[in-house]
Interface confidence: low
């Protein structure tokens, strides 16, 4: 996976004159029709209930820092994470719940019971997805909580836990 | 979140004189790449199968009427819609099921069983999504049928049941 | 369902001259802002672990061939399956899985654990799915492993098991 | 810590119907499983099945025909029936607490079928 | 009703040896295998439960690994009292299901 520089803003863009000139292909490849995405996987090592990301996967026009996606350009973004769990069931039933936060507030969340006959199976094996479509300004963080981190399964499945976003539509 | 003002249609697009004249970063905003999206919560009170919606959401070149979503410009779309149900088990099992209409026709459908185990628990919770890729023409509208409308948990949730559509391709 | 034919490459586009002239929406019509879209349907009949496809679903820009989609346009793609499962459970529990493969390598998988009690129930219903957001290249191919596709429901849910990728942003 | 105790006769008679009782101390039975294994003089291991709390059973095919197991909460038991024993039923008897796999064994019950 | 398969059935060996022993199931089983310890006239201890994970108070000397099919318990020193008949148990399917048993005796 490669993480991609963001390329120049549209306040760049040589509309008229300047490299561009009048070379109508230059100019579309370089009109501001933004596009910014993120695909990070679950760090290995998961000790609270935020959860935290691997930033060397794909981001382009969006920053990672401390388990925050942070929005760089302004626009209606849509955002999905997906969550591998593999309980060891108790005696009891579990509740997995995944929530979505827009600068720590929780907009969106998912929740699905485990173990819900009360037997004990050796393992059982559950995938959550959670999809958001917001508008997000620059500077806004995207982040996951996760009550039950400790059944997000890292190791068996270290590629199956994301968090997605991608710009839709830019507010210009 | 808000509503968002239909923009002018692609025909009223001045590409040659009129306000844009020669301003290329005019005309490239303006240009027929057109963008439509809808982001509806459901309604807090569900009395039938069809479900209802908050039209106070994200609406984007997109009507809300009656339960439906009504399109407004041809192209290709993106249709999701996600619910979180919350089940006071009997002593059988229940089969939950969302059901995406396309012009009052059942175009795709997801089930999942819960409460297998047939024991009374105090609750299992349970989330669904459906996703639909297709060509829509004008007036097409969207619709979501769920049997056990019941279970959907407007109180706890009210933020978790969503049906989102949005343009991809357009007609041109 | 329609398919479509692909559009000419953006190397095609008269950007001066030609037929487009000095008609800028002909222009912007015909620029390199590629969309490559594809939406197929599992096939009726399956008999081994890699699923095949009703090729006469929505192809655009990109191929199918021997249960794999294959890529037209190099960039960014947004890929998601989505099954409907009907399970028979046995006396033991049964872990569905769904493995998505680009150029036959396992990238991401959903497992879900049904019939977890243990106790024979005539059926239970499982959806699953899954998504992934990757850089494919040309000729770069797309499947799906199932492990137990004889649970994959074709007869009652024929249009409910599909296989969807589309271009966000093309390397140009 | 946890510990069990098989008890019942240990001959009887063929045709007749073994009966054992496993009292479980240290610890709650509520919200685990609870098993039989037995092991005929010389050879392997054989799980006969076992009971939840709430009464749920599961029992080896090979035996179904001829075993119930029942449980008693209030007094910290649960216990085998076997009927029509014949011979080849003449094994030591474990309980064992069947968690993530069988954590905790009693001691074990020698029973013999002879007339 | 799974088969498990357990060899050897029985295996000479020195105090300070490494020994492994190895269970085949006829089926897939995922990690729902334990392995227990068992002494003349005693019962079975648990050694290692869902494949590899080392139960409460077992010495680390003893290790499981598998692969769904293919399980191995290893002991990596022997010492004077590992000697005894070990067995694997299946618990995924119905019903439960025990290997024939591997004696370990002193060479």
């Known amino acids: 996976q490669r993480t991609d520089s963001i390329p120049n803003s549209p306040d760049n863009i040589p509309l008229r004159g300047g490299n561009c000139s009048e070379d109508l292909l230059c100019i579309l490849k370089r009109a501001p029709f933004k596009k910014s995405w993120a695909y990070l996987q679950v760090a290995k090592h998961l000790n609270k209930t935020k959860l935290s990301w691997n930033k060397d996967g794909i981001l382009h026009g969006v920053r990672y820092q401390d388990g925050n996606l942070v929005i760089q350009f302004p626009g209606l973004y849509f955002i999905i994470c997906q969550l591998q769990f593999l309980v060891q069931c108790p005696n009891n039933s579990v509740d997995l719940k995944l929530e979505l936060l827009i600068n720590k507030h929780i907009k969106k969340q998912a929740l699905v019971t485990v173990c819900e006959s009360g037997m004990q199976t050796k393992h059982v094996y559950q995938n959550l997805s959670q999809f958001l479509l917001d508008y997000l300004q620059v500077n806004t963080t995207v982040s996951v909580n996760v009550d039950t981190f400790q059944y997000i399964d890292t190791s068996t499945f270290p590629l199956e836990n994301v968090l997605s976003v991608f710009l839709y539509s830019n507010s210009d | 979140q808000r509503t968002d003002s239909i923009p002018n249609s692609p025909d009223n697009i001045p590409l040659r004189g009129g306000n844009c004249s020669e301003d290329l970063l005019c005309i490239l905003k303006r240009a027929p790449f057109k963008k439509s999206w809808a982001y509806l919560q459901v309604a807090k009170h569900l009395n039938k199968t069809k479900l209802s919606w908050n039209k106070d959401g994200i609406l984007h070149g997109v009507r809300y009427q009656d339960g439906n979503l009504v399109i407004q410009f041809p192209g290709l779309y993106f249709i999701i819609c996600q619910l979180q149900f919350l089940v006071q088990c009997p002593n059988n099992s229940v089969d939950l099921k969302l059901e995406l209409l396309i012009n009052k026709h059942i175009k795709k459908q997801a089930l999942v069983t819960v409460c297998e185990s047939g024991m009374q628990t105090k609750h299992v919770y349970q989330n669904l999504s459906q996703f639909l890729l297709d060509y829509l023409q004008v007036n097409t509208t969207v619709s979501v049928n769920v049997d056990t409308f019941q279970y959907i948990d407007t109180s706890t949730f009210p933020l978790e049941n969503v049906l989102s559509v949005f343009l991809y391709s357009n007609s041109d | 369902q329609r398919t479509d034919s692909i559009p000419n490459s953006p190397d095609n586009i008269p950007l001066r001259g030609g037929n487009c002239s000095e008609d800028l929406l002909c222009i912007l019509k015909r620029a390199p802002f590629k969309k490559s879209w594809a939406y197929l349907q599992v096939a009726k009949h399956l008999n081994k672990t890699k699923l095949s496809w009703n090729k006469d679903g929505i192809l655009h820009g990109v191929r199918y061939q021997d249960g794999n989609l294959v890529i037209q346009f190099p960039g960014l793609y947004f890929i998601i399956c989505q099954l409907q499962f009907l399970v028979q459970c046995p006396n033991n529990s049964v872990d569905l899985k769904l493995e998505l493969l680009i150029n036959k390598h396992i990238k991401k998988q959903a497992l879900v654990t049904v019939c977890e009690s243990g106790m024979q129930t005539k059926h239970v219903y499982q959806n699953l799915s899954q998504f992934l957001l990757d850089y494919l290249q040309v000729n770069t191919t797309v499947s799906v492993n199932v492990d137990t596709f004889q649970y994959i429901d074709t007869s009652t849910f024929p249009l409910e098991n599909v296989l969807s990728v589309f271009l966000y942003s093309n390397s140009d | 810590q946890v510990q069990l105790q098989e008890s019942g006769p240990g001959l009887v008679k063929p045709s007749e119907t073994l009966s054992l009782t496993c009292t479980v101390s240290?610890?709650?039975?509520?919200?685990?499983?609870w098993s039989w294994i037995r092991q005929p003089p010389g050879k392997g291991l054989e799980w006969i099945g076992y009971i939840f709390y709430s009464g749920y059973t599961k029992y080896n095919p090979s035996l179904k025909s001829r075993v119930t197991i029942s449980v008693d909460t209030s007094k910290n038991q649960f216990s085998l029936k076997l009927s029509s024993v014949t011979a080849a039923d003449t094994a030591v008897y474990y309980c064992?607490?069947?968690?993530?796999?069988?954590?905790?064994w009693g001691q074990g019950t020698l029973v013999t079928v002879s007339s | 009703a799974i088969q498990m398969t357990q060899s050897p059935s029985s295996l000479s060996a020195s105090v300070g040896d490494r020994v492994t022993i190895t269970c085949r199931a006829s089926q897939g089983i995922r990690n729902n295998l334990g392995w227990y310890q068992q002494k003349p006239g005693k019962a079975p201890k648990l050694l290692i439960y869902a494949e590899s994970s080392l139960q409460s108070g077992v010495p680390s000397r003893f290790s499981g690994s598998g692969s769904g099919t293919d399980f191995t318990l290893t002991i990596s020193s022997l010492q004077p009292e590992d000697f005894a008949t070990y067995y694997c148990?299946?618990?995924?399917?119905?019903?439960?299901?025990f290997g024939q048993g591997t004696k370990l005796e002193i060479k």
């Open positions: 148990l299946q618990d995924f399917n119905y019903p439960y299901t």
């Open positions: 240290g610890g709650s039975i509520s919200g685990y499983y």
């Open positions: 064992a607490r069947d968690r993530w796999d069988f954590d905790y």
